[in-house]
């Protein structure tokens, strides 16, 4: 198996969960 490492250039050391809804629901079917 392979191993790879990723490094973000973002300087914050705390992952921001702010890009995702806190209590998401499924998208409605239209």
């Amino acid at each position: 198996s392979e191993t790879t490492t990723g490094t973000s250039s973002n300087s914050s050391q705390s992952t921001s969960n702010s890009g995702l809804a806190p209590n998401p629901t499924n998208a409605t079917t239209k």
């Epitope: 973002n10 992952t15 809804a21 629901t25």
Partner: antibody, heavy 115, light 112 residues
């Protein structure tokens, strides 16, 4: 410095299983919502699964295409997130990225499902 | 699923000139808490994606302020005020409002 190190990718036969692992460092892992996202030339970026933190009772979410076949889990004591992939299909082939709620990303590990 | 549609598919920009990418969602991305979970990601050649912007217009730490995001509901735009050589790559919009999270098909930015 934040690092996400993925491992476990490789070649597997259709119907087979594989377990991916992602080790995080330099980040407050226990508070991070962790996702797996895959990338293929055909479908582009495709979200696979997510596991949230202790505060949200480690709730998990899955894409419909992997529900019942894939299981996401985490070990906060080791700052690791896992993706157990069972009953693999050729369409599961791709580069699998571990990401902290789309904020920090690993470099990806390649999974090829082929006979 | 919410479908994210990006335009153009690709664009070629001279260094120092502005660039603009559009992203349209098939449903409103406004969440019940009043926030809109629209993200922009950059993927440089041979690298993994990196988030630039979250919640439509908030820049992630370390992202140059030449990047900006705007829009609401179903219509969003990523702007680069002055393109630099390091900006080449593919840009994706991604919604985090409704499951499953979905991505746009990408816009390839090339340098003239």
């Amino acid at each position: 410095e934040v690092k996400f190190e993925e491992s476990g990718g490789g070649l597997v036969q259709p119907g087979g299983s594989i377990k991916l692992s992602c080790a995080a460092s330099g980040v407050t892992f226990s508070e991070a919502w962790m996702d797996w996202v895959r990338q293929t030339p055909e479908k582009g970026l495709e979200w696979v699964a997510e596991i949230r933190d202790r505060e949200t009772k480690y709730v998990t979410y899955y894409a419909e295409s992997v529900k019942g076949r894939f299981t996401i889990s985490r070990d906060d004591s080791k700052s690791r997130v896992y993706l157990q992939m069972n009953n693999l299909r050729t369409e599961d082939t791709g580069i699998y990225y571990c990401t902290g709620a789309m904020d920090y990303w690993g470099q990806g590990t390649s999974v090829t499902v082929s006979s | 699923d919410i479908v994210m549609t990006q335009t153009p598919l690709s664009l070629s920009v001279t260094i120092g000139q502005p660039a603009s990418i559009s992203c349209k969602s098939s449903q409103s991305l406004l969440y019940s808490n009043g926030k809109t979970y629209l993200n922009w990601l950059q993927q440089r050649p041979g690298q993994s994606p990196k988030r630039l912007i979250y919640q439509v217009s908030k820049l992630d730490p370390g992202i140059p302020d030449r990047f900006s995001g705007s829009g609401s509901e179903t219509d969003f735009t990523l702007k680069i005020s002055r393109v630099e050589a390091e900006d080449l790559g593919i840009y994706y919009c991604m919604q985090g409002t409704s499951l499953p999270w979905t991505f746009g098909g990408g816009t390839k930015l090339e340098i003239k």
